[in-house]
């Protein structure tokens, strides 16, 4: 029979190759069927009989078309600082990732070796760069006219409210206190909001305030992105 309509097992043309989802069996010297994902070769082919496939047992898998005699073992259960983001099935291995509020501080071939808690910026400091699955939060001191009164891995520096009459001036860790009943907010370039953090973390980013035209509004120079070593906390 011509190769394109041959049924497995069959001898390939001299110098030819086996078709997609087939492999060349050295012992039988024939093109034989591979097993689909989720299965493995229970019995290898011969000159007269094709590969016999069988389902992977519990906690084992094959992800590709294959002719392996045994399925691969799924990895261990996820460590307590990780969560299972993909379950072990017959067709895929378990995948563990760092739990919400944590990031991968050191990854290795086998996955994340060390998860670490995201840095929390203390009052007077805001998030300059949000954490990702593989990088920590970067904190920066709040620029003049902005503040953060929280210990948080997501909160940025927010602009002080603008008062007609100031009762207590704001500082880096406290908002201004007004005596009037209708304070407004300045929109300081140094307080531009960051993109939301990655979806693996709870999000507490403040809504973006509208620009204000209240009397006394001053525009501030944006703060550079390089933060000092301090300004984070583990509390």
């Amino acid at each position: 029979l011509p190769a394109q309509v041959a049924f497995t097992p069959y001898a390939p043309e001299p110098g030819g190759t086996c078709r997609l989802r087939e492999y060349y069996d050295q012992t039988a010297q024939m093109c034989c069927s591979k097993c689909p994902p989720g299965q493995h070769a229970k019995v290898f082919c011969t000159k007269t009989s094709d590969t016999v496939c069988d389902s992977c047992e519990d906690s084992t898998y094959t992800q590709l078309w294959n002719w392996v005699p045994e399925c691969l073992s799924c990895g261990s259960r996820c460590s307590s600082d990780q969560v299972e983001t993909q379950a072990c099935t017959r067709e895929q291995n378990r995948i563990c990732t760092c739990r919400p509020g944590w990031y991968c501080a050191l990854s290795k071939q086998e996955g994340c070796r060390l998860c670490a808690q995201l840095r929390k910026c203390r009052p007077g400091f805001g998030v300059a760069r949000p954490g990702t699955e593989t990088s920590d939060v970067v904190c920066k001191p709040c620029a003049p006219g902005t503040f953060s009164n929280t210990t948080s891995s997501t909160d940025i520096c927010r602009p002080h409210q603008i008062c007609h009459v100031v009762a207590i001036p704001g500082n880096a860790s406290m908002d201004a206190v007004c005596t009037s009943t209708s304070p407004t907010r300045s929109m300081a370039p140094g307080a531009v909001h960051l993109p939301q953090p990655v979806s693996t973390r709870s999000q507490h980013t403040q809504p973006t305030p509208a620009p204000s035209t209240a009397p006394g509004t001053s525009f501030l120079l944006p703060v550079g992105p390089s933060p000092p070593a301090e300004g984070s906390t583990g509390d």
Epitope: G75, S76, R77, C78, S79, S80, D81, Q82, R94, C96, A105, L106, K108, Q109, E110, G111, C112, R113, L114, C115, A116, Q117, D136
Partner: antibody, heavy 124, light 112 residues
Framework: QVQLVQSGAEVKKPGASVKVSCKAS????????LSWVRQAPGQGLEWMGW????????NYAQNLQDRVTMTTDTSTSTAYMELRSLRSDDMAVYYC?????????????????WGQGTMVTVSS | DIVMTQTPLSSPVTLGQPASISCRSS???????????LNWLQQRPGQPPRLLIY???NRFSGVPDRFSGSGAGTDFTLKISRVEAEDVGVYYC?????????FGQGTRLEIK
């Protein structure tokens, strides 16, 4: 041979800062992590944090995160640990320890080489 | 944080006799990569700690074969088959499975 040599003993006043150095020799500095561990007089071991010598990334113990900074100078294969706003309960022997964690799957993943320790006394 | 608890805290032994130290972790030390990152350290008087055993049962280079480690999950043991005078000191178990790295409170080995 593989060794870590630390700077000498320090006496500091409360509120001051101390910077301890740890010079590595006998191995490829960039291929390992370095942890800092302290031991108060008559007490057990407390992990302070670590630095990945390959990329400079750090992770600190939560209770020290505000006050500690770990750095490396790869040109001299030296690691540094600075502790600020010293208190009386910071009085301890400070150790640097090589952490064999950056290499292959068969690495020890343990603190395999230790410095001789640096005594930091905090007294007014 | 993973809490490491050692027993006993003090162990008086006779030279040439065996000694055993137990270490229990508050949660499993099996990492998702399949390894168990439980190590044993020895600290002789006036000296820095020294690595004895890594990943539960692997002796570090230069460590005498009278030291052995065993265990799994949350329960681990360090055994000394025949105690020698140079074994006097404090022994710590430590986990490097996850942050923060934690140590047992130490077991003091002394000669009777």
């Amino acid at each position: 041979q593989v060794q870590l040599v630390q700077s000498g003993a320090e006496v500091k006043k409360p509120g001051a800062s101390v910077k301890v150095s740890c010079k590595a020799s006998g191995y490829t500095f960039l291929s390992y992590g370095l942890s800092w561990v302290r031991q108060a007089p008559g007490q057990g071991l407390e992990w302070m944090g670590w630095i990945n010598a390959y990329n400079g990334n750090t992770n600190y113990a939560q209770n020290l995160q505000d006050r500690v900074t770990m750095t490396t100078d790869t040109s001299t294969s030296t690691a540094y640990m600075e502790l600020r706003s010293l208190r009386s309960d910071d009085m301890a022997v400070y150790y640097c320890a090589r952490w064999d964690i950056l290499t292959a799957y068969y690495s020890s993943d343990a603190f395999d080489i230790w410095g001789q320790g640096t005594m930091v006394t905090v007294s007014s | 944080d993973i809490v490491m608890t050692q027993t006993p805290l003090s162990s008086p032994v006779t030279l040439g006799q065996p000694a055993s130290i137990s270490c229990r972790s508050s949660q499993s030390l099996v990492h998702s990569d399949g390894n168990t990152y439980l190590n044993w350290l020895q600290q002789r008087p006036g000296q820095p700690p020294r690595l004895l055993i890594y990943k539960v049962s692997n002796r570090f280079s230069g460590v005498p074969d009278r030291f052995s480690g065993s265990g799994a999950g949350t329960d681990f043991t360090l055994k000394i088959s025949r105690v020698e005078a140079e074994d006097v000191g404090v022994y710590y178990c430590t986990q490097t499975t996850q942050f923060p790295i934690t140590f047992g409170q130490g077991t003091r080995l002394e000669i009777k």
